[in-house]
Amino acid sequence: EPHSLRYNLTVLSWDGSVQSGFLAEVHLDGQPFLRYDRQKCRAKPQGQWAEDVLGNKTWDRETRDLTGNGKDLRMTLAHIKDQKEGLHSLQEIRVCEIHEDNSTRSSQHFYYDGELFLSQNVETEEWTVPQSSRAQTLAMNVRNFLKEDAMKTKTHYHAMHADCLQELRRYLESSVVLRRRVPPMVNVTRSEASEGNITVTCRASSFYPRNITLTWRQDGVSLSHDTQQWGDVLPDGNGTYQTWVATRICQGEEQRFTCYMEHSGNHSTHPVPS
């Protein structure tokens, strides 16, 4: 799993007039990390784990970055020509990643009224536009605006790419939180399915980092993929993750089945409760 930093900014317009505020959230490694507090006009950490990432450092830099990005996005929305009356939104999602091989990725995506209309691979400058005619029109509109001051745009996006990666590296280097290993708590439950069958569910929770193997085994051999159901690996709000795997088995054969878990080089097996 690569380390990632994801910025999600939204600006609004009403009857063609761009509103003054903006909404902003930042995710670090898929976890809610920062949000922009519009009352206090400051970036605020999302929970204790986010505060722990930066320790006693202030959030001034993050506040400055989000404020600048919000201003840029409002200017972009002001140049979208097809705004009709009522409420409209322009959303920008920016993601940068550092992979295990140290290669990096950086991308940017624009959504109008919730619909993706323009993406850019920031490193290569490649733009992609969905096929729909509305997306094509919006994309042309926004790209023309961004091209109006080509040098500024070029500098802005390359700086954005560098800044995102620089921030991500800063968080990774300064934070013990992001280098920690938290083993999962594993819990196996059973429930009646249909006559003669039971559903067994294995849940792993409160683990970090995100990478985990969770699978059902019969007589020590992993079951095939299509006989198991997996849940997504999701953040649990505390800077850790949770997931689950379930399968259906014959009643009376419980002792043949175990849940196998592997995480950060450690592994364990968990029986079905009788």
Partner: antibody, heavy 115, light 108 residues
Framework: QVQLQESGPGLVKPSETLSLTCTVS?????????WNWIRQPPGKGLEWMGF???????KYNPSLKSRVTISRDTSKNQFSLKLSSVTAADTAVYYC????????WGQGTTVTVSS | EIVLTQSPATLSLSPGERATLSCSAT???????FHWYQQKPGQAPRLLIY???NLASGIPARFSGSGSGTSYTLTISSLEPEDFAVYYC?????????FGQGTKLEIK
């Protein structure tokens, strides 16, 4: 109809600088896309050398270190490749190509490095 | 850099048969930045499939592409005599852009 055409000397001496130009017709190089140089040594595979983008940004293959320079002349709708300190290993067919998924290519020009 | 490894290096098949060419990457690639090319002797490569699964202009429907992450596949459903050539995969996710070493599709 988009067309790309490479031009330049077919023979370069070792330690000298290889210079090639790609003339583009049917599309403005400042409108969009990356404008790439790609080479293919005899009997071998393809190697991406670098590009100049529509905005003027240049990106290079680190394997060519600091030997490669790509520039553009927007008034002539051309972009150029310079490869310094060439050796026999730089003997190849040199292609210019448009895009990121390279949708238009020149026909290629053979450059031999020999004294 | 992302290294692309194509397999097999050479594939010997007869016209009418189905061809499956693979390309494996050392790091995950976004499917919108993955492409396939065909090259015949003495010619420039030509774009065959762009963004993993989209046929380039003028490419017949017997060609198809699929894949995600680190594993991609080019399939030719029923080989025609003109399909025997060298095929290259390419990624445009990160700089440097890289190609696979090529798969030579030859007549059996």
């Amino acid at each position: 109809q988009v067309q790309l055409q490479e031009s330049g000397p077919g023979l370069v001496k070792p330690s000298e600088t290889l210079s090639l130009t790609c003339t583009v017709s049917g599309y403005s190089i400042t409108s969009d896309y990356a404008w790439n140089w790609i080479r293919q040594p005899p009997g071998k595979g393809l190697e991406w050398m670098g590009f100049v983008s529509y905005s003027g940004t240049t990106k290079y293959n680190p394997s060519l270190k600091s030997r490669v320079t790509i520039s553009r002349d927007t008034s002539k709708n051309q972009f150029s490749l310079k490869l310094s300190s060439v050796t026999a290993a730089d003997t190849a067919v040199y292609y210019c190509a448009r895009g990121y998924g390279f949708d238009y290519w020149g026909q290629g020009t053979t450059v031999t490095v020999s004294s | 850099e992302i290294v692309l490894t194509q397999s097999p290096a050479t594939l010997s098949l007869s016209p009418g048969e189905r061809a499956t060419l693979s390309c494996s990457a050392t790091s995950s690639i976004s499917s919108i930045y993955f492409h396939w090319y065909q090259q015949k002797p003495g010619q420039a490569p030509r774009l065959l499939i762009y963004r993993t699964s989209n046929l380039a202009s003028g490419i017949p429907a017997r060609f198809s592409g699929s894949g995600s992450g680190t594993s991609y596949t080019l399939t030719i459903s029923s080989l025609e005599p003109e399909d025997f050539a060298v095929y290259y995969c390419q990624q445009g996710t990160t700089i440097p852009f890289t190609f696979g070493q090529g798969t030579k599709l030859e007549i059996k």
